[in-house]
């Protein structure tokens, strides 16, 4: 799903207040709900009718450093007989997410939000058939 | 997928530098790749064999203010005849994502990262059957 444009109002102080100096603001250390965890079913990426693999990207100057991307294994979907049915489509499910980018020059460290597109998994879809004249 | 714990090292300056004052750091305004957009197939939430609905939550002190959550419509999956097959499972696909929480007291505005669990969509899974003795 989409993350809307900032419009640069969310990070501004109220109009009656002095502006933020130097185009930056204060980010408190620590993460709210840091211990919250995904509780997905075991091995769904292998047992789905639209199975997928995971690829891990790693960047030490990004938080989280590890971003996992899914790739659908098949064009079609796996039927009850375990065969690929090409009349159906394995389709990626994408999500816009935020990460934090770390920028440093010597002892001067600053951070910036970055939008990343993550493919989270795949789903099996019945395509609409069109016969082109 | 999981976001690892910060371990509070990512946001620290190198050891040889003076510590961050007051437990906060500098966040630059603006978002890298802000114009990047999800390009998912049209209406996959309705055309999937494990269809889902969307619910929007809104919070003006969160960025993004709008967070969209998916809920699987069925327990089972939709078969080729358009009927629900309860021998299969519609299973939610979850993703940990970051949002920014805005905290203000008068003209003093600060921000903090928050972890949010988002259900992005659903996939159809063949469960392994166990008969309990």
């Amino acid at each position: 799903r989409k993350i809307p444009k900032v419009g640069h109002t969310f990070f501004q102080k109220p109009e009656s207040c002095p502006p933020v100096p130097g185009g930056s603001m204060k980010l408190d250390i620590g993460i709210i709900n840091e211990n919250q965890r995904v509780s997905m079913s075991r091995n769904i990426e292998s047992r789905s009718t639209s199975p997928w693999n995971y690829t891990v990207t790693w960047d030490p100057n990004r938080y989280p450093s590890e971003v996992v991307q899914a790739q659908c294994r098949n064009l079609g979907c796996i039927n009850a007989q375990g065969k690929e049915d090409i009349s159906m489509n394995s389709v990626p499910i994408q999500q816009e997410t935020l990460v934090v980018r770390r920028k440093h020059q010597g002892c001067s460290v600053s951070f910036q939000l970055e939008k990343v597109l993550v493919t989270v998994g795949c789903t099996c879809v019945t395509p609409v058939i069109h016969h082109v004249q | 997928r999981k976001i690892p714990k910060v371990g509070h090292t990512f946001f620290q300056k190198p050891e040889s530098c003076p510590p961050v004052p007051g437990g906060s750091m500098k966040l630059d305004i603006g978002i890298i790749n802000e114009n990047q957009r999800v390009s998912m197939s049209r209406n996959i939430e309705s055309r999937s064999t494990s269809p889902w609905n969307y619910t929007v939550t809104w919070d003006p002190n969160r960025y993004p203010s709008e967070v969209v959550q998916a809920q699987c419509r069925n327990l089972g999956c939709i078969n080729a005849q358009g009927k629900e097959d309860i021998s299969m499972n519609s299973v939610p696909i979850q993703q940990e994502t970051l949002v920014v929480r805005r905290k203000h007291q008068g003209c003093s505005v600060s921000f903090q990262l928050e972890k949010v669990l988002v259900t992005v969509g659903c996939t159809c899974v063949t469960p392994v059957i166990h008969h309990v003795q």
Epitope: - | L75, P127, V128
Partner: nanobody, 116 residues
Framework: QVQLVESGGGFVQAGGSLKLSCSVS????????MGWFRQPPGKGREFVAG????????FYGDSVRGRFTISGDNAKHTLYLQMNSLKPDDTAVYYC?????????YGQGTLVTVSS
């Protein structure tokens, strides 16, 4: 290991009521949904009712909708099926199940007999 123990089955006249219980114990992992299937004599297993754990949504098979009610008691780790306006067609072995999304566990069943 998951344990599922059904109880409450028995003999009842058409139009009567019964309440089935299912006690869940052991490693209950991530629960996607849980509920009841039934198997009438000489027929295949059919879905009766289910409850989704994440939001408490309930789901019913066409033949029981409006007559049967599924509910759960988290504190007691027990699942219930209230069966009203029973018909002879409801005669079956009723199986409790628990489903993690990727694994489904069935109990041993309890027999319900509805006489006309």
């Amino acid at each position: 290991q998951v344990q599922l123990v059904e109880s409450g089955g028995g003999f009842v006249q058409a139009g009567g009521s019964l309440k089935l219980s299912c006690s869940v114990s052991g490693n209950t992992f991530i629960t996607n949904h849980m509920g009841w299937f039934r198997q009438p004599p000489g027929k295949g297993r059919e879905f009766v009712a289910g409850i989704r754990w994440s939001d408490g949504s309930t789901f019913y098979g066409d033949s029981v909708r409006g007559r049967f009610t599924i509910s759960g008691d988290n504190a007691k780790h027990t699942l219930y099926l209230q069966m009203n306006s029973l018909k002879p067609d409801d005669t079956a072995v009723y199986y409790c199940y628990i489903d993690s999304g990727s694994d489904r566990y069935y109990g041993q069943g309890t027999l319900v007999t509805v006489s006309s």
